[in-house]
């Protein structure tokens, strides 16, 4: 069953490769557990960059290594994506799934650019 | 018939632990979440937490993180509890209840384990 | 948290009698995704665990006499009883079912004459 998933458009990534954006989901009904998954679209090529499941009133939990964090309230979830480069640019679309109490239910938004700059490297000092 | 059969009630010492078990049968032990629920003597009702038996992944009242722990053992389909630090307030009859399987509202429960804390 | 609040805590009435009890709750338990009513009703007879009467705020469980009736929506829901029996003797409590964390009414004790 389709769910509608909303995020923005187009985020900037911070000098330090950082970038955070919400992504908000309408939930049909009662919901105890959601799985959030974010996918990288580029060169139509699509990747999955994290993943996480998580009961309501609880953290996400991503996996140690990864570069994901997220905090969640109500039906929005709160994604970062950390250690981004210039050659992570791309389209990063917010899956959501309604894993629990059935039905299933699966939603995926429009994606959100993403536009990371690698900082100049400073000038050396004579 | 579904059926959740819990362990027997338990006079234990403040400061100590205890382990509670949910035993269910009748149905299929990871398709459903498991509640746990605290009543108080001549008190009303309050939620601990729920546990999904099939990857263990729990939630909890946030009065009772520290304080409650939720497992489950997929091979034997049982639920358990775990009360730490008890004091006198921990005194009551704890129940395992199962989401039912067709509204998923707490439509089975066990018959209660009572917890008495006294020195 | 969502407060649930119920009266009157107790009453006394007399076999054949119809009965009313109340449950508010601090917000609301319509879901605006399904419009459903996310409030469920127990019963709980002395030295048993509590059993599901009602659920979806209208929803008789299986094998609930239909003298009770549930009703009501966002925050005000009603139990009814329309003829009192000697075993309806009881506590009832409402419930919260909307999210985490679920939270139970303080109880309405029904006794009879």
């Known amino acids: 069953k389709a769910m509608h998933v909303a995020q923005p458009a187009v985020v900037l990534a911070n000098s330090r490769g950082t970038a955070s954006f919400v992504c908000e989901y309408a939930s049909p009904g009662k919901a105890t557990e959601v799985r959030v998954t974010v996918l990288r679209q580029a060169d139509s090529q699509v990747t999955e960059v994290c993943a996480a499941t998580y009961m309501m009133g609880n953290e996400l939990t991503f996996l140690d290594d990864s570069i994901c964090t997220g905090t969640s309230s109500g039906n929005q979830v709160n994604l970062t994506i950390q250690g981004l480069r210039a050659m992570d640019t791309g389209l990063y679309i917010c899956k959501v799934e309604l894993m629990y109490p059935p039905p299933y239910y699966m939603g995926i938004g429009n994606g959100t650019q993403i536009y990371v700059i690698d900082p100049e490297p400073c000038p050396d000092s004579d | 018939e579904v059926q959740l059969q819990q362990s027997g009630p338990v006079l234990v010492k403040p400061g100590a632990s205890v382990k509670m078990s949910c035993k269910a049968s009748?149905?299929?032990?990871?398709?459903?979440?498991m509640n746990w629920v605290k009543q108080s003597h001549g008190k009303s009702l309050e939620w601990i937490g729920a546990?999904?038996?099939?990857?263990?992944?729990?939630s909890y009242n946030q009065k009772f993180k520290g304080k409650a722990t939720l497992t489950v053992d997929k091979s034997s389909s049982t639920a358990y509890m775990e009360l730490n630090s008890l004091t006198s307030e921990d005194s009551a009859v704890y129940y395992c209840?199962?989401?039912?399987?067709?509204?998923?509202?707490?439509?089975?429960w066990g018959q209660g384990t009572s917890v008495t804390v006294s020195s | 948290d969502i407060v649930m609040s119920q009266s009157p805590s107790s009453l006394t009435v007399s076999a054949g009698d119809k009965v009313t009890m109340s449950c508010k709750s601090s917000q609301s338990l319509l879901h605006s995704g399904n419009q459903k009513n996310y409030l469920a009703w127990y019963q709980q007879k002395p030295w048993q665990p509590p059993k599901l009467l009602i659920y979806?705020?209208?929803t008789r469980e299986s094998g609930v006499p239909d003298r009770f009736t549930g009703s009501g929506s966002g925050t005000d829901f009603t139990l009814t009883i329309s003829s009192v029996q000697a075993e309806d003797l009881a506590v009832y409590y409402c419930q919260n079912d909307y999210g985490y964390p679920y939270t139970f009414g303080g109880g309405t004790k029904l006794e009879i004459k």
């Open positions: 979806g705020a209208s």
């Open positions: 209840a199962r989401d039912g399987s067709i509204h998923y509202v707490m439509d089975d």
């Open positions: 546990i999904n038996p099939d990857h263990g992944g729990s």
């Open positions: 009748g149905y299929t032990f990871t398709d459903y979440y």
